[in-house]
């Protein structure tokens, strides 16, 4: 089965929907090979029979109306379906359900009853039909301004449910962007791999990175990003001066703005690149970024020397996609296995380095840097979310702190670098930052505020600072670091934590923790999340189980211990309609939560109260 296709299964009858003809939609023993049983979403609310390239619909919104197949019409109210609670499936905006088995009727009918015979799943899963939801495919080039492919579409009186090369000599795959190409003549190429599709991209000969300039399209920022992602790419990020110069040349003949990946869509943080590249190079148009609310997305202006301007994300523009090795210098971020034996007194170890906050004696940035270097280190450079979360959660960082780190643009204006010379691989700006205020003299960077995010600051301001040095193998672990915890467990706040040593299913991991007189970890707030991210994020394993799942009640996530879910840290598109158990990711998306099948094997984190901690009283109900 193509990933978009599925069989519509009723668990009670143990049968699947079978389209025998356009006027007869019945059920049969499930057979994943049978074309007549394959269906797929072709819009947010329409389901198409793969065999007939026609859509499921009804003649009227009435009880006991027959469900049959019709020419797909995105405007028809009689072809709009929706998933309701608990695998119920029916016509949109009604309480009439897709039903089989009542009154000895062989055909699928609309029925007002919401019993087991009106409940449908994707065959072979526990998921409702909407879990295989429609994903719009944005066309490229052509004459339709990047519009979405309309499946099925008619060409030379034949219906196509997929991209086709029909009518072309070059084999390029295309789609109609209305249901009737013969009438409307609107088309675009499909964002798929086919012979010659590399011609859709421009390759920078210096870096090998590929760029796609979609100047004829007119999409919102989010649509543009979806289009790039469909091609295993992302909206453009610019981290190097050379890259900006290459793009200036590439776009010089164009006049209209093009979406790039820069945005301030995260409420808690500042400017960031979609895809996670560090925001370290600034190329704003004079007067930008505008502080007007809602202008959270950024376009590159070819006519204005390819400088950047922030706009409302719903504007429709062309866009630039980027794929291939990132422009970041090759740099090995230490993994957790490189953790040293320890650090000098008052310094804290993490992944091969030692860290210390100095807040007693405030210094201007230059003198703070000198002080760190005198101790054998440098102002702290931060290369990953894990390292950031370690500093934030384990160094004694305080919400009212404002501390120098090593990032600055002293050498080249608008191009931030670390004072220790390591490459910039990560940034975490506060909202509205970097602002380059005070006559553009904010050349140094501080970590500040309750989240420890960053802001640029005038370097002459006396502040506390964070030093970092390479660890010395003979040094000692800070005293009392894991007080109240058994050997091998790590202390944070009132709790002890252990990383499970074996790959286990969710159930087995839960048993292991119980045997250790602990439980699969809960996450109560962002401080605990930051600690856990720093604990597991750099490890080579892909996932670590937490105690969260919706196995007891699909759609309602609960911890294995009866604690309220008060904090979440979902990855993009999670939990969606997925059912299962929740694990923390490592790597680029370090610490973010994904829903996995509970039978998958992953490492895990156990948690229990530390010895000597006075527990709060149990809440009374």
């Amino acid at each position: 089965l193509d990933a978009r296709q599925f069989l519509i299964y009723n668990e009670d009858h143990k049968r699947c929907v079978d389209a025998l003809s356009a006027i007869s939609v019945q059920t049969a023993t499930c057979n994943p090979e049978a074309e007549s049983q394959k269906f797929r979403w072709v819009s947010d609310s329409q389901i198409m029979s793969v065999a007939f390239k026609l859509c499921l619909g009804v003649p009227s919104k009435t009880d006991w109306a027959s469900v049959t197949l019709y020419a797909c019409d995105s405007k028809s109210e009689y072809q709009k379906w929706e998933c309701k609670n608990d695998t119920l499936f029916g016509i949109k905006g009604t309480e009439l359900y897709f039903n089989y088995g009542n009154r000895q009727e062989k055909n699928i009918k609309l029925y007002k009853g919401s019993g087991l015979w009106s409940r449908w799943k994707v065959y072979g899963t526990t998921d409702d039909l909407c879990s295989r939801g429609y994903e719009a495919m944005y066309s490229l080039l052509g004459n339709a301004n990047g519009a979405v492919c309309a499946f099925p579409f008619k060409f030379e009186n034949k219906w196509y449910a997929d991209c086709t090369s029909a009518g072309r000599s070059d084999g390029w795959l295309w789609c109609g962007t209305t249901t009737d190409y013969d009438k409307d003549k609107l088309f675009g190429f499909c964002p798929l791999h086919f012979e010659g599709s590399e011609r859709l991209w421009n390759k920078d000969p210096l870096t090998g990175i590929l760029y796609q300039i979609n100047s004829k399209s007119a999409l919102t920022w989010h649509q543009a990003r979806a289009s790039c992602k469909q091609q295993n790419a992302d909206l453009l990020s610019v981290t190097e001066i050379h890259e900006q110069m290459y793009l200036t040349g590439l776009t010089s003949s164009l006049s209209s703005g093009l979406w790039i990946g820069l945005n301030s869509l995260s409420v808690r943080s500042g400017w960031q690149w979609a895809g996670g590249s560090p925001f370290r190079y600034l190329n704003w148009l004079p007067g930008s970024p505008s502080s007007e609310p809602g202008k959270s997305c950024v376009s590159l202006n070819p006519g204005k020397n390819a400088k950047w301007e922030n706009l409302e994300c719903v504007q429709k523009l062309g866009y630039i996609c980027k794929k291939g090795n990132n422009t970041l210098n090759p740099f090995i971020i230490p993994s957790a296995s490189d953790v040293p034996t320890g650090c000098p007194n008052q310094w804290w170890p993490y992944a091969g380095h030692c860290y210390r906050i100095h807040r007693e004696e405030k210094k201007i940035q230059k003198y703070a840097l000198q002080a760190c270097r005198k101790e054998g280190g440098d102002l702290a450079s931060i290369h990953s979310i894990e390292e950031f979360d370690f500093i934030f959660s384990q160094l004694g960082y305080e919400p009212n702190d404002e501390l120098w780190i090593g990032l600055n643009d002293i050498k080249i204006q608008m191009y931030f670098e670390w004072s220790d010379g390591t490459p910039v691989t990560f940034t975490k700006w506060l909202p509205g930052e970097p602002s380059h205020e005070n006559n553009r003299q904010e050349d140094c960077v501080v970590m500040k505020g309750k989240d420890g995010y960053w802001a640029d600051r005038a370097c002459e301001q006396p502040l506390g600072y964070i030093c970092k040095m390479v660890s010395q193998s003979h040094a000692v672990v800070p005293e009392g670091a894991d007080k109240g915890c058994r050997k091998g467990w790590k202390r944070h706040g009132f709790y002890c934590y252990l990383i499970g040593s074996t790959l286990s299913t969710f159930t087995d991991a839960n048993h292991t923790c119980t045997n250790e007189k602990a439980y699969l970890t809960t996450v109560e707030d962002r401080y605990e999340q930051a600690f856990l991210t720093s604990l597991v994020g750099l490890r080579p394993e892909k996932y670590f189980w937490t105690g969260l799942s919706d196995v007891q009640n699909k759609g309602t996530f609960r911890w294995t211990v009866d604690e309220q879910v008060q904090f979440t840290h979902w990855n993009a598109d999670m939990p969606g309609r997925k059912a299962g158990c929740v694990a923390m990711k490592t790597g680029v998306a370090g610490g973010l939560w994904d829903v996995l099948s509970c039978e998958e094997k992953a490492k895990f984190v156990c948690k229990h109260w530390a010895e000597g901690v006075t527990r709060p009283p149990e809440p009374t109900t």
């Epitope: 052509g142 072309r168 190409y181 088309f187 011609r199």
Partner: nanobody
Framework: QVQLQESGGGLVQPGGSLRLSCAAS????????IGWYRQAPGKQRELVAT???????NYADSVKGRFSISRDNAKNTVYLQMNSLKPEDTAVYYC?????????????WGQGTQVTVSS
């Protein structure tokens, strides 16, 4: 824009040969592939042969082993060598170019050249 000019058509006896030429001009760098199509009276236009930018070729089953498509990059010309011609090959032969900037699915067409196979 791409302009296409066909030549080389004519009257030939069954079993004979002809070589058609298609000269391309204009924005030739945008061309992905050039194909030959034909249309006999009262019939649908059908694909005969194609050659892509990378040099891969493709033929209709009815002409495999008899027709051969080739190109001369220096002259921006594509050729269709037609051997062992049959009366059913009689048609107007059209040259077609597909580019990545096509504003309709079919791309660009030449005016066509008539090929008649008759004794």
């Amino acid at each position: 824009q791409v302009q296409l000019q066909e030549s080389g058509g004519g009257l030939v006896q069954p079993g004979g040969s002809l070589r058609l030429s298609c000269a391309a001009s204009g924005n030739i760098f945008s061309i992905n592939a050039i194909g030959w199509y034909r249309q006999a009276p009262g019939k649908q236009r059908e694909l005969v042969a194609t050659i892509t930018l990378s040099g891969s070729t493709n033929y209709a089953d009815s002409v495999k082993g008899r027709f051969s498509i080739s190109r001369d990059n220096a002259k921006n010309t594509v050729y269709l060598q037609m051997n062992s011609l049959k009366p059913e090959d009689t048609a107007v032969y059209y040259c077609n170019a597909n580019t990545y900037s096509d504003s309709d699915v079919y791309g660009y067409w030449g005016q066509g050249t008539q090929v008649t196979v008759s004794s």
